[in-house]
């Protein structure tokens, strides 16, 4: 393992001394450190026209270390590289450069994008969403009874969030109106006071509905006769069928 030849010796330079500072084992007035104490790294720093030897506990930024049997030596990385494994492979680039496969580039190749946190070129990642869930039960104000027209919802999950240049995510929730066979709420489903309050409020809404084509929001109306009600229901069912044929749906976007 030992070096076969060319080991630096103190005879190399007339001004070699062993009264050195900063981790040097041998040094000279002109060249600084010539060799280092055990476990320290020898690095040549250029100062003007001359190179000065320095001994450090680890290699500085822009250098990598090799532990030879007789010397621990720092070698310069390529100019645009801040940290490297060896001459060929950079692991962190200098500011303004992006790392790609061990090289430092000023912009990322086609099909890749710059990650400005890691300063690396990474693959563009597109959004991936799951399949839609089944439609929820037809509901109105959190209940599945006491109304004829409500809304139903379906959702999906984002499986993969996109990177900066990736395709955006689609809506994760979709809502549409629905019609059900009206059924009265059982006693357990609403209280007396609530029923009275709702009836008053809903009567107002029913009046509104006779003069508009908005969704039916009411329970039974105390104003309409059963015949009127039946007529109205038939009309609304026809409208609903026509709407279903057109497959109109209202999308509520929750884009991630």
């Amino acid at each position: 393992q030992n070096a076969s030849r060319g080991r630096r010796q103190r005879r190399m330079h007339p001004n070699v001394s062993q009264g050195c500072q900063g981790g040097c084992a041998t040094c000279s007035d002109y060249n600084g450190c010539l060799s280092c104490k055990p476990r320290l790294f020898f690095v040549l720093e250029r100062i003007g026209m001359k190179q000065i030897g320095v001994c450090l506990s680890s290699c500085p930024s822009g250098y990598y270390g090799t532990r030879y049997p007789d010397i621990n030596k720092c070698t310069k990385c390529k100019v645009d590289c801040d940290t490297c494994f060896n001459k060929n492979f950079c692991t962190k680039c200098k500011s303004g450069f992006y790392l790609h496969l061990g090289k430092c580039l000023d912009s990322c190749p086609e099909g890749l994008e710059a990650n400005n946190h890691t300063m690396e070129c990474v693959s563009i990642v597109h959004c991936e969403a799951s399949e839609w869930s089944p439609w929820s039960p037809c509901m109105k104000k959190g209940k599945t009874c006491g109304f004829k027209r409500g809304t139903e919802t379906r959702v999906r999950d984002i499986l993969q969030h996109p990177s900066a240049k990736g395709n955006l995510c689609p809506p994760t929730s979709e809502t549409r109106t629905c019609i059900v066979q009206r059924k009265k709420c059982s006693k357990g489903e609403r209280g007396k006071k609530g029923r009275e309050r709702k009836r008053k409020k809903l009567n107002k809404e029913e009046r509104k509905e006779t003069s508009s084509s908005s969704d039916s929001k009411g329970l039974e109306s105390s104003i309409e006769t059963p015949d009127q009600q039946e007529n109205k229901e038939r009309q609304q069912q026809q409208k609903r069928r026509a709407r279903d044929k057109q497959q109109k749906s209202v999308s509520v976007s929750t884009v991630h």
Partner: antibody, heavy 116, light 107 residues
Framework: EVQLVESGGGVVQPGRSLRLSCAAS????????MAWVRQAPGKGLEWVAT????????YFGDSVRGRFTISRDNSKNTLYLQMNSLRAEDTAVYYC?????????WGQGTMVTVSS | DIQMTQSPSSLSASVGDRVTITCLVS??????FVWYQQKPGKAPKLLIY???RLQDGVPSRFSGSGSGTDFTLTISSLQPEDFATYYC?????????FGQGTKLEIK
């Protein structure tokens, strides 16, 4: 394109000598430490020797120290391995390789057979 | 010298399998660690350097992990061209030492 081409292998009797050469192209030869790595038939990889970029220092594996010498001619982009006092256990494919902590570039190898 | 213990020494697997090879090192080497692939009759080829960095041209199904004394090479979905012998190497200090190799064979 990086190319390392070994030559000089062959069949040799125990105790005799052989000199391997490796011609390099496609990279700055004088910037790299160069090494020889060998592989006995059906066995794993074994580092043999490394010479630093300027030829001033060389290092050897325990099994070859004192018998093998490594040298280089940067003007000719060529690496050498002088193998003396060869033994049967030196039988292997010898690869020339650029050694910079990892072995980044490899030649195709040259077979050395030591047999009486 | 730093000792490298690679396991398993051989492994049978099928195309599409996920495969893991490990290398234990006798002392802490940080991430100064390399993986090579060698096919019969060919020279070794550097796959991964600095424990986890892929060499240019190496498919992304290969990945390396670990630091200190425990290192792993994973092939996420084996392809026919991946059947070869894999070696680990420590690049922390001289002398450079290799693992014994893992021969990956078709089941």
């Amino acid at each position: 394109e990086v190319q390392l081409v070994e030559s000089g292998g062959g069949v040799v009797q125990p105790g005799r000598s052989l000199r391997l050469s490796c011609a390099a192209s496609g990279f700055t030869f004088s910037d790299y430490d160069m090494a020889w790595v060998r592989q006995a038939p059906g066995k794993g990889l074994e580092w043999v020797a490394t010479i630093i970029y300027d030829g001033s220092r060389a290092y050897f594996g325990d099994s070859v120290r004192g018998r093998f010498t490594i040298s280089r001619d940067n003007s000719k982009n060529t690496l050498y391995l002088q193998m003396n006092s060869l033994r049967a256990e030196d039988t292997a494919v010898y690869y020339c390789t650029a050694h910079d902590r990892s072995f980044d570039y490899w030649g195709q190898g040259t077979m050395v057979t030591v047999s009486s | 010298d730093i000792q490298m213990t690679q396991s398993p020494s051989s492994l049978s697997a099928s195309v599409g399998d996920r495969v893991t090879i490990t290398c234990l090192v006798s002392e802490d080497i940080s991430n100064d660690f390399v993986w090579y692939q060698q096919k019969p009759g060919k020279a070794p080829k550097l796959l991964i350097y600095a424990a986890s960095r892929l060499q240019d041209g190496v498919p992304s199904r290969f990945s390396g992990s670990g630091s200190g004394t425990d290192f792993t090479l994973t092939i996420s979905s084996l392809q026919p061209e991946d059947f070869a012998t894999y070696y680990c190497q420590q690049s922390y200090k001289y002398p450079p030492t290799f693992g014994q190799g893992t021969k990956l064979e078709i089941k």
